[in-house]
């Protein structure tokens, strides 16, 4: 069962470059954390589309937290239509694209894909089914969309991560907003489908922000997130109308929508990794 003469080259994580420009964590709601300190911080409010002040408790919380208003604006706001195009094209690879292949310690043989930073291509590997890391995609297409360079050497995807219910691994999922749209609806419409951790197979719909449509998925019956609707109509009503469509010349066409204030449940945040 062992190969004693194997060379001791250990696959490990490389040094990760910092992410710049637009990030999916800008959609997180402000989280003061469980501690009791009173620290002035800033977060991006997806509903007002502005950086706002909040009081941080000093521990935990999430990545939508900045020391200064300027830093928050730099990371999360878009100045104008031209800048939207520019920042989308200049999007760097997510951190997890630079993690090495990690099958995890278990012994399931699940075909997955990872981005190989040496070859600069997505490649197939066998995932064991537990632990592992986020450079782990269910399809080659998904891996390419998120981690490979586009035709001009640019990255074009934003991203999110979710807890994969089948094998309890952290699996990257694309949460790219199509470049012709800006989203101003409920923040959970930007989250990936999350089937949850139970064993049922219920027919549900989620809003796919990559293609701007509601799509069916199988819900396990528990857990998951708010991007989960019993009908396509309900899904469209909640999420589709949250988009403002941009004309290619930079003008805006507003689609009709009701600005109904909605509470975001904690479950929404839990699909994101707190410390990447």
């Amino acid at each position: 069962d062992s190969e004693e003469d194997e060379e001791h080259t250990i696959i490990t994580d490389t040094e990760l470059p910092p992410l710049k420009l637009m990030h999916s964590f800008c959609a997180f709601k402000a989280d003061d954390g469980p501690c009791k300190a009173i620290m002035k911080r800033f977060f991006f409010n997806i509903f007002t589309r502005q950086c706002e002040e909040f009081i941080y408790g000093g521990c935990e919380g999430n990545q939508n937290r900045f020391e200064s208003l300027e830093e928050c604006k730099k990371m999360c706001t878009r100045d104008n239509a031209n800048r939207i195009i520019k920042t989308t094209l200049q999007q760097e690879k997510p951190d997890f694209c630079f993690l090495e292949e990690d099958p995890g310690i278990c012994r399931g043989y699940i075909t997955r894909y990872f981005y190989n930073n040496q070859t600069k291509q997505c490649e197939r590997f066998k995932y064991g089914g537990c632990l592992g890391n986020m450079n782990n995609f269910e399809t080659l297409e998904e891996c390419k969309n998120i981690c490979e360079d586009g035709p001009n050497g640019f990255q074009v995807d934003n991203y999110g991560t979710q807890l994969n219910a089948v094998n309890n691994s952290l699996t990257p999922q694309s949460t790219k907003v199509p470049s012709l749209f800006e989203f101003h609806g409920p923040s959970w419409c930007l989250t990936p489908a999350d089937r949850g951790l139970c064993r049922a197979n219920e027919n549900r719909f989620y809003y796919n922000s990559v293609i701007g449509k509601c799509r069916p998925f199988k819900y396990s019956g528990c857990g998951g997130n708010e991007n989960n609707f019993t009908s396509k109509q309900e899904c469209l009503r909640a999420c589709k109308k949250g988009f403002i469509q941009r004309i290619s010349k930079g003008g805006l066409i507003k689609t009709k929508r009701k600005r109904k204030k909605q509470r975001v449940k904690i479950a929404y945040e839990e699909i994101f990794v707190k410390n990447m």
Epitope: S2, E4, E101, L170
Partner: antibody, heavy 125, light 107 residues
């Protein structure tokens, strides 16, 4: 019966490197059905997983973010053991260090089923 | 990382008592939870894995239950050798994390 025997110094000076070894009997460090980890325990932090290595046609590892820049876990197949190196230690690294085996890997319910006896490492000048 | 919170942090009980320790995860971990027992100067010992499966050689008075975020370890009739510290551990997400421990003391 799997047994893990730890060895290494109990006192390390600040900024130096903590080095511990875990000798395995009753299993192989390069077994495809196991993974080998280090966990530490201190009053302030409780039980804290530091990292593990495992062999699946090649060697892999995974490290805790809190120590990632300072830690190395290496196998020694000739001696059937694995080691922990933690660089640039501070008094906060004072803890009891345990090596352990991840078991249950074939079933997907994973757990630390065998542990070393523990080594109290004090970081002090 | 997933935070694991045990309660109570300590409890006093008598031999023969039924003891319940709870463990709460900061997010859904399905049934990916283990329980360990640790005695002074010793390494932790696996009691229960996968929420409810008893490790070989562990007395049947130990049982585990729960799912999602809330889990329970029960000792149906406390024995003198059961006075120890008990830890839960989640493995639903990398990194694996442990609870802070529950000390079971003699009343």
């Amino acid at each position: 019966q799997v047994q893990l025997q730890q060895s290494g110094p109990g006192l390390v000076k600040p900024s130096q490197t903590l080095s511990l070894t875990c000798a395995i009997s009753g299993d192989s460090v390069s077994s495809n059905g196991a993974a080998w980890g280090w966990i530490r325990q201190s009053p302030g932090r409780g039980l804290e997983w530091l990292g593990h290595i495992y062999y699946r046609s090649k060697w892999y590892n995974s490290y805790a973010v809190s120590v990632k820049s300072r830690i190395t876990i290496n196998p020694d197949t000739s001696k059937n053991q694995f080691s922990l190196q933690l660089n640039s230690v501070t008094p906060e690294d004072t803890a009891v260090y345990y090596c352990a085996r991840w078991g249950g890997i074939h079933d997907g319910d994973i757990y630390f089923d065998y542990w070393g006896q523990g080594t109290l490492v004090t970081v002090s000048s | 990382d997933i935070q694991m919170t045990q309660s109570p942090s300590s409890l006093s009980a008598s031999v023969g008592d039924r003891v319940t320790i709870t463990c709460r995860a900061s997010q859904n971990i399905s049934n990916y939870l283990n329980w360990y027992q640790q005695k002074p100067g010793k390494a932790p010992k696996l009691l229960i894995y996968g929420t409810s499966s008893l490790q070989s050689g562990v007395p049947s008075r130990f049982s585990g239950s729960g799912s999602g975020t809330d889990f329970t370890l029960t000792i149906s009739s406390l024995q003198p050798e059961d006075f120890a510290v008990y830890y839960c551990q989640q493995y639903g997400n990398n990194p694996t994390t442990f609870g802070q421990g529950t000390k079971v003391e003699i009343k």
